[in-house]
């Protein structure tokens, strides 16, 4: 997928974390249960 940033950005977070994408990970999600 592609994201374009420019005149506006919804990436900013109100928390103390940075709004940039976190480092990539190969981790897969397991179903709960």
């Amino acid at each position: 997928s592609e994201t374009t940033t420019g005149t506006s950005s919804n990436s900013s977070q109100s928390t103390s974390n940075s709004g940039l994408a976190p480092n990539p990970t190969n981790a897969t999600t397991k179903a709960a249960g």
Partner: antibody
């Protein structure tokens, strides 16, 4: 040690395309986004965008969205940036830079000079 | 987009001097500001990230401080190898933006 080695200088005519490569070594290529930054002669730094090497997701600077293509080949730990419809004001040094979530652009390639001239 | 304004644009100083460069953001970027050093013909080098954290291998004479919209880079005692151009860069949100640079010259 982390190293990013870029392809050599290019001279292109207006309207042409250029493709710059960036070969990574010394770390897990898929563990960090790869960004691209350019610097026109005597000017400052301008972020063009970045690619996620695992998913190939990209985030672009609006200014370059219609002309830039970012790809990667994880089998050879190499990222590519192609800029099309070149103009004289695209003459610049183009850098790849690893982006770590915590530290930002922590390691940079040596730069590739692209000259656009008729 | 966020705008980053560095001041001064040019700075003349002598070896041993203490110098301070300021970077102001047009809106809060929390602590997420990085500083880079660039010498002519070379790639930028990361000095400081997250406002105040020294990158590995960077001498302790470099110090970053600030949060929100105002940040400073201080070099406590200038060495000959410190004369270069310095850029701030926000890493809080997209698009990633750099300041216009501060050229530090020998007086």
């Amino acid at each position: 040690q982390v190293q990013l080695v870029q392809s050599g200088a290019e001279v292109k005519k207006p309207g042409a395309s250029v493709k710059v490569s960036c070969k990574a070594s010394g770390y897990d290529f898929t563990g960090y986004h790869m960004g691209w930054v350019r610097q026109a002669p005597g000017q400052g730094l301008e972020w063009m965008g970045e690619i996620n090497p695992i998913t190939s997701d990209k985030t672009f600077n609006q200014k370059f969205k219609s002309r830039v293509t970012m790809t990667r080949d994880t089998s050879i730990s190499t990222a590519y940036m192609e800029l099309s419809r070149l103009r004289s004001d695209d003459t610049a040094v183009y850098y790849c830079a690893r982006r770590d979530y915590g530290t930002s652009l922590d390691y940079w390639g040596q730069g590739t000079t692209v000259t656009v001239s008729s | 987009d966020i705008q980053l304004t560095q001041s001064p644009s040019f700075l003349s100083a002598s070896v041993g001097d203490r110098v301070t460069i300021t970077c102001r953001a047009s809106k809060s970027i929390k602590k997420y500001l990085a500083w880079y050093q660039q010498k002519p013909g070379k790639a930028p080098k990361l000095l400081i990230y997250a406002g105040s954290t020294l990158h590995s291998g960077i001498p302790s004479r470099f110090r970053g401080s600030g949060s929100g919209t105002e940040f400073t880079l201080t070099i406590s005692s200038l060495q000959p190898e410190d004369f270069a151009t310095y850029y701030c860069q926000q890493h809080n949100e997209y698009p990633i933006i750099f300041g216009q640079g501060t050229k530090l010259e020998i007086k």
